[in-house]
Amino acid sequence: HSFGPGPGLGTPRSPCNARGPCRLFFRVCLKPGVSQEATESLCALGAALSTSVPVYTEHPGESAAALPLPDGLVRVPFRDAWPGTFSLVIETWREQLGEHAGGPAWNLLARVVGRRRLAAGGPWARDVQRTGTWELHFSYRARCEPPAVGAACARLCRSRSAPSRCGPGLRPCTPFPDECEAPSVCRPGCSPEHGYCEEPDECRCLEGWTGPLCTVPVSTSSCLNSRVPGPASTGCLLPGPGPCDGNPCANGGSCSETSGSFECACPRGFYGLRCEVSGVTCADGPCFNGGLCVGGEDPDSAYVCHCPPGFQGSNCEKRVDRCSLQPCQNGGLCLDLGHALRCRCRAGFAGPRCEHDLDDCAGRACANGGTCVEGGGSRRCSCALGFGGRDCRERADPCASRPCAHGGRCYAHFSGLVCACAPGYMGVRCEFAVRPDGADAVPAAPRGLRQADPQRFLAGVIAVIVVVVIAIVAGIVVLVISRKKRMAKYEKAEIKEMGEMHRELNA
């Protein structure tokens, strides 16, 4: 494990301040999985403080990443069955040493909290937690103390007699009906927290505790590692046998001494303090979050978990932040719903991952016979007469631009518009002024301008009127034909669009 400044956080910070040497401690606290992580509830499942802490003295220019840490293992004894789900709280404390008022000063450097799932007897689970500028790398596992076994450290009954001979008030043991369930009466005074018994009048200690009544923590025992604690009145006995004498590790496990105790390296398929727990099989359901267990048909074969989307870890116990992979394209907002991933797309984009750009002509076509024009990374619709809006879906008001001159009144028409001219004006847009004698019509000219040749001018005006009439007739013919074509195209586009919408809704 390691504790130090996180990456990319500039110059490594020293955990000690300028007041001299310091030591780091880890406090590990286990709470039931149902408790609120943020609340200061009791460490109901257990708590422990790291021991064998080296002193860290700050030297100028020394990297904080190389700071010495407590003994690599922090053991937290827990009572009753292992719940599988728990809240893990790890606090990193600094003890400032040296001469200053009030003795040693304690400061909480960092506190990481997380809800975890872990089956007892499984492999080490690795984790990295960041808080502020600090980063903590650690591993954790749960192991059962005998006689508890299994993923939940259930205390199994000891074989006493056949169910037919179970005494009054006693019932057959589950899951072993050929045994009897009988409450053991431990030695009077045996610690209920740190001791247990399998036979009447005995007191066996959980790991980390010693003494006849299991009330003495191993770390605070006055005996040296090489001595065995005796009764309270006798102090220490002479050196007894070593922890590995007689090899306490079952099933071929190899024993190694660790700070006055022992640790068993178990062969594959066995777990527990003394390798007494046979391996987990797929039938035990070791894979969390619905993970698929493969292999592990018998205790000697290892299992592998195939995790559902959004989970990882050897037992699928860790949730992946799938949004950190930025699956939503084009600036879409990622939402990890746990059982699914959703992208909320920005305007102009669509699709499960916002991969479809609605702002290009490959997207939806312009409606009502409009044509799509691309340019500058965006698209716009050039709409047919009488239509407007982004996709030419809105009916345009041709009179909105006040096209009729000289106070003419505008009327919208299926093919465009018609101007009803004010008295004294004529023309498609009322642009011609009519002479008072009715002889001819002239374009409304600015005051002060005069026509030099009335005859030639009149001939020109008549020619213009004839051209305009011919143009209007030809225009109407063209419009009627194109409208028929446009309506057919529009119906096709509508059918295609309905199909697309249906497909999108189903997806």
Partner: antibody, heavy 117, light 107 residues
Framework: EVQLVESGGGLVKPGGSLRLSCVAS????????MNWVRQAPGKGLEWVGQ??????????HYAESVKGRFTISREDSKNTVYLQMNSLKTEDTAVYYC????????WGQGTTVTVSS | NIQMTQSPSSLSASVGDRVTITCKAS??????VSWYQQKPGKSPKLLIY???NRYTGVPSRFSGSGSGTDFTLTISSLQPEDFATYYC?????????FGGGTKVEIK
Amino acid sequence: EVQLVESGGGLVKPGGSLRLSCVASGITFSNFWMNWVRQAPGKGLEWVGQIRLKSDDYATHYAESVKGRFTISREDSKNTVYLQMNSLKTEDTAVYYCTTGYYFDYWGQGTTVTVSS
Amino acid sequence: NIQMTQSPSSLSASVGDRVTITCKASENVGTYVSWYQQKPGKSPKLLIYGASNRYTGVPSRFSGSGSGTDFTLTISSLQPEDFATYYCGQFYSFPSTFGGGTKVEIK
């Protein structure tokens, strides 16, 4: 050996109710997500719903076609998962299977539900 | 929901033949695809998970491949006990959905 055994199927009228059970053996039942999957006569497989673990507050998820009508529950002490089916429709006629996990690794033999007037 | 389209819906083959069944997803499902075998009157059995991994106890003649939207189940040498209906299923997005099935019959 892992075994899942469904029961409770039968003939029921439209609008009626039925409760299916699935008893598991050979597995640590409380550690497994449980699902119901159905298969209409001559048709393919359709996921119906799922119930997760005690540590997940027994969270349930359902297919849109059964939401509000079907309810899944479990009794870990009895190694049993249930499917309560209300307001049954003719289209609910199918063989109902219980399965484990996210990937449907273990399956029961199925129980037949017929909804007909 | 993601649609899984299986083809063919049925096929006839002889013992020893190489059989290929395809499955197409309506959108990218990564490699979160499983294949199941179902014999008449029996429950389905998991054959392949993660698109290409054989489940415990599945013979090596069964293999799966593909990623994204196109997936394949191959039986390298068809055996008499392999005549059944095969289903693909996607597990990328909730809810899980299945293909319509492919019935493998004796020619």
